[in-house]
Amino acid sequence: GWVWNQFFVPEEMNTTSHHIGQLRSDLDNGNNSFQYKLLGAGAGSTFIIDERTGDIYAIQKLDREERSLYILRAQVIDIATGRAVEPESEFVIKVSDINDNEPKFLDEPYEAIVPEMSPEGTLVIQVTASDADDPSSGNNARLLYSLLQGQPYFSVEPTTGVIRISSKMDRELQDEYWVIIQAKDMIGQPGALSGTTSVLIKLSDVNDNKPIFKESLYRLTVSESAPTGTSIGTIMAYDNDIGENAEMDYSIEEDDSQTFDIITNHETQEGIVILKKKVDFEHQNHYGIRAKVKNHHVPEQLMKYHTEASTTFIKIQVEDVDEP
């Protein structure tokens, strides 16, 4: 019968020929009366056999990631008779792995959106690297993730690549962050190879800013001939939030005379001071009203940022009109 051990050849060997092992018949007494032959894909080009001894050699550099095993056939012939000594047999040469591939992030570019002011531990995104080396061969494809850039706001779980928030962030101070993640094989041991990826993390807005008047004091004038409903001027607040979170409503907080009203222009986010009652210069020619401004939409959990509405004082001077 045939005698052999399992055949392994390390990939990426640089020698011109590398002895893999020996194929022999147990009928072979070593007097060179038998001839060994190799058949199949790779025979003669990648692998050769010593016809007399049955020793097998790899004569080409192999890449396991290209091909991890070769199935060949062996024959042994009696030189004298030309007859097969053993039935033709199939055998396998396995290409063994070395750590010759760095981890690669295949789903780049990574981008994630997370609400500003999210608490520590909030999941942002998971990044995954793959390593073409053999996962069953030692630690060649066992990866560890680490953060190269992004502290102190982000952290990465070493074994999963899950990125989490580690410190609260304020969109109004910075609205996006570039995080750089490294994946290292060999679980970070010497000889490890690494790959990196960038993750763009954008902060979405939450309503954590109340509107604040641009001026603490406004001065407007109104002619005593102005009819009710006249717009006598505008006031304006600013809100560091964006979109719906910056929509505001103006209102009168204080007007003993009940002469004025404020409506909100939702296009411009301005407050328009309106004459509600006709004025008479001879009766009263100086008015003072206090206006306030609040956000239109404030979720309950964000009310702590909106405890006291911003106010402004408006001095209104009535202009005299000569009466006939």
């Epitope: 001026e215 004091l217 001065r219 005379s257 001879e282 009766h283 009263q284 004082f313 001095k315």
Partner: antibody, heavy 120, light 107 residues
Framework: QVQLQESGPGLVKPSQTLSLTCTVS??????????WSWIRQHPGKGLEWIGY???????YYNPSLKSRVTISVDTSKNQFSLKLSSVTAADTAVYYC????????????WGQGTLVTVSS | EIVLTQSPGTLSLSPGERATLSCRAS???????LAWYQQKPGQAPRLLIY???SRATGIPDRFSGSGSGTDFTLTISRLEPEDFTVYYC????????FGPGTKVDIK
């Protein structure tokens, strides 16, 4: 803290024009929403508002003095001025400049006052 | 114009006593448009109260204002020696007019 300081002659002859200047420090005369007034106090008597000006130059005067009063402003010098023409002895008074308040038309800041005597 | 009348003209009290000064307007004014000032001899008036119950910055809480319509009051809860001086009311709704003043002197 806003401070106001009146300056000008302490003696004016009858029929002449009284001229005073108020210099503002610790704040800009161009601050939005504030009006700058002149007020006087006859010796041993009460207070009389003369008029005010806004930094844009818009002025409003006490109707009883309107025909004789002009108030002007010089934002580059942070000053405003009072001119009262055709003075008589009845215009002898301590003249104050003042600024109104951030929550109304009351007078929050005052100068220390300057006595102007009308006499020949 | 709105005429303001203050009474009494002179109020004679002792330190520690309560002082009640009155200001009456010739016609109704909004309470938001009345102020009180204190004036010591040789000095400019000093704003005490506006609107008519808000204390100006740095004014002790023994000073308080109240009133509406045509009748307004300045109250000094416990007179201190430095409170014996002249007090004026002022309206600032229809132009600007001052009352003639009330002198608080030591009895």
């Amino acid at each position: 803290q806003v401070q106001l300081q009146e300056s000008g002659p302490g003696l004016v002859k009858p029929s002449q024009t009284l001229s005073l200047t108020c210099t503002v420090s610790g704040g800009s005369i161009s601050s939005s929403g504030y009006y700058w007034s002149w007020i006087r106090q006859h010796p041993g008597k009460g207070l009389e508002w003369i008029g005010y000006i806004y930094y844009t130059g818009s002025a409003y005067y006490n109707p009883s003095l309107k025909s004789r009063v002009t108030i002007s402003v010089d934002t580059s010098k942070n000053q405003f001025s009072l001119k009262l023409s055709s003075v008589t002895a009845a215009d002898t008074a301590v003249y104050y400049c003042a600024r109104d308040g951030s929550s109304g038309w009351y007078f929050q800041y005052w100068g220390q006052g300057t006595l102007v005597t009308v006499s020949s | 114009e709105i005429v303001l009348t203050q009474s009494p003209g002179t109020l004679s009290l002792s330190p520690g006593e309560r002082a009640t000064l009155s200001c009456r307007a010739s016609r109704q004014i909004s309470s938001s448009y009345l102020a009180w000032y204190q004036q010591k001899p040789g000095q400019a008036p000093r704003l005490l109260i506006y609107g008519p119950s808000s204390r100006a910055t740095g004014i002790p809480d023994r000073f308080s204002g109240s009133g509406s319509g045509t009748d307004f009051t300045l109250t000094i809860s416990r007179l201190e020696p430095e409170d014996f001086t002249v007090y004026y009311c002022q309206q600032y709704g229809s132009s600007f007019t001052f009352g003639p003043g009330t002198k608080v002197d030591i009895k």
